[in-house]
């Protein structure tokens, strides 16, 4: 089965852990893909090890384990991502997460504490 | 540097049989899985037949299912694909093909062009 | 079998255009197709992986989008270089299944 943390948020700027656990008695994991809705982020294979798909290559970071850290989130990174495990002989297995991401704190909360009174 | 290098093409008649090789270096094989790939002359590309890295599974085409055995052997660094009961239609350049993750295919061969004509 | 289904089959265009390739599967086949150029008398030559990641090595005027059934191969500024023939693959599932083919001639 896969266990995952259905709902995250993270902040606008910062980062996120992606990650899903797998577990069975008899089933070994052959191959780990990861996607962002449709799109390819990367994917972790036994034989291969990590690719990480290029269009995120300046963003994602394999790990920790199996799972993703996704870095510089934006806004339009909200939505579902999904893990699916390959595994012999167990077959495949998908898990779902959705990433709120959030406005910054220093944007929520405006810049009043940086203004400073003028000078002189 | 990557390299996969097809031989054992040539002219057969209907019905004959040939043994395609191709010897990969420069990439450690036995982690990939590999593929066949053809192509007639004048004609797109038609995927003929793949096997998984450590050999337990292999996929055909209809068109050669029955026909065509892919096999590897890991300790020669070498694919294969017998061909039986040759038919005209079975005339290609046959590519040997490397594919990561069992998604695309980052390598090909060079090509052997095989003839099936009486 | 997924059929993959490539428009146009042939263009004529001059250096520096913009060319749009459109590549349709007969179902949804999420992000699992690769587009390769192939030049006469090569062998084709990857240049997106999964729908939209463009394979190391391979310029940036290429870029690939799309996903499910309806994807895009586009050369944003067409090089003397650039004139082949295109193919969209999808490896979602066996059989593998490619495209017709796009060919790129000289205006």
């Known amino acids: 089965t896969i266990d995952t943390k259905r709902n995250i948020s993270a902040e606008e700027g910062g980062s996120v852990i992606l990650q899903c656990h797998f577990s069975s008695d008899t089933a070994e994991v052959t191959q780990v893909d990861w996607k962002q809705q449709d799109q390819l982020l990367a994917i972790y294979s036994v034989d291969l090890g990590w690719h990480v798909a290029s269009v995120f290559s300046d963003r994602v970071v394999p790990g920790p384990s199996l799972g993703l850290t996704f870095q510089s989130l934006t806004m339009n990174d909200t939505g579902e991502y999904f893990c699916t495990y390959h595994t012999y002989p167990g077959g495949i297995y998908k898990g779902r997460i959705f990433l709120k991401v959030q406005e910054s704190s220093d944007d929520r909360n405006g810049l009043a504490q940086f203004q400073t009174a003028p000078l002189g | 540097e990557v390299q996969l290098l097809e031989s054992g093409g040539g002219l057969v008649q209907p019905g004959g049989s040939l043994r395609l090789s191709c010897a990969a270096s420069?990439?450690?094989?036995?982690?990939?899985?590999m593929h066949w790939v053809r192509q007639a002359p004048g004609k797109g590309l038609e995927w003929v037949a793949s096997i998984k890295s450590d050999t337990s599974s292999t996929y055909y085409a209809d068109s050669v299912k029955g026909r065509f055995t892919i096999s590897r052997d890991n300790s020669k660094n070498t694919l294969y694909l017998q061909m039986n009961s040759l038919r005209a239609e079975d005339t290609a350049v046959y590519y040997c093909?490397?594919?990561?993750?069992?998604?695309?295919?980052?390598?090909w061969g060079q090509g052997t062009l095989v003839t099936v004509s009486s | 079998d997924i059929q993959m289904t490539q428009s146009p089959s042939s263009l004529s265009a001059s250096v520096g255009d913009r060319v749009t390739i459109t590549c349709r599967a007969s179902?949804?086949?999420?992000?699992?197709l690769n587009w390769y150029q192939q030049k006469p008398g090569k062998a084709p030559k990857l240049l997106i992986y999964?729908?939209?990641s463009l394979q190391s090595g391979v310029p940036s005027r290429f870029s690939g989008s799309g996903s499910g059934t309806d994807f895009t191969l586009t050369i944003s500024s067409l090089q003397p270089e650039d004139f082949a023939t295109y193919y969209c693959?999808?490896?979602?599932?066996?059989?593998?299944?490619f495209g017709g083919g796009t060919k790129v001639e000289i205006k």
């Open positions: 420069g990439f450690t094989f036995s982690s990939y899985s």
């Open positions: 999964a729908a939209s």
């Open positions: 093909a490397r594919v990561p993750y069992d998604y695309w295919i980052d390598y």
């Open positions: 179902q949804s086949i999420s992000s699992y």
């Open positions: 693959q999808q490896s979602y599932s066996t059989p593998l299944t």
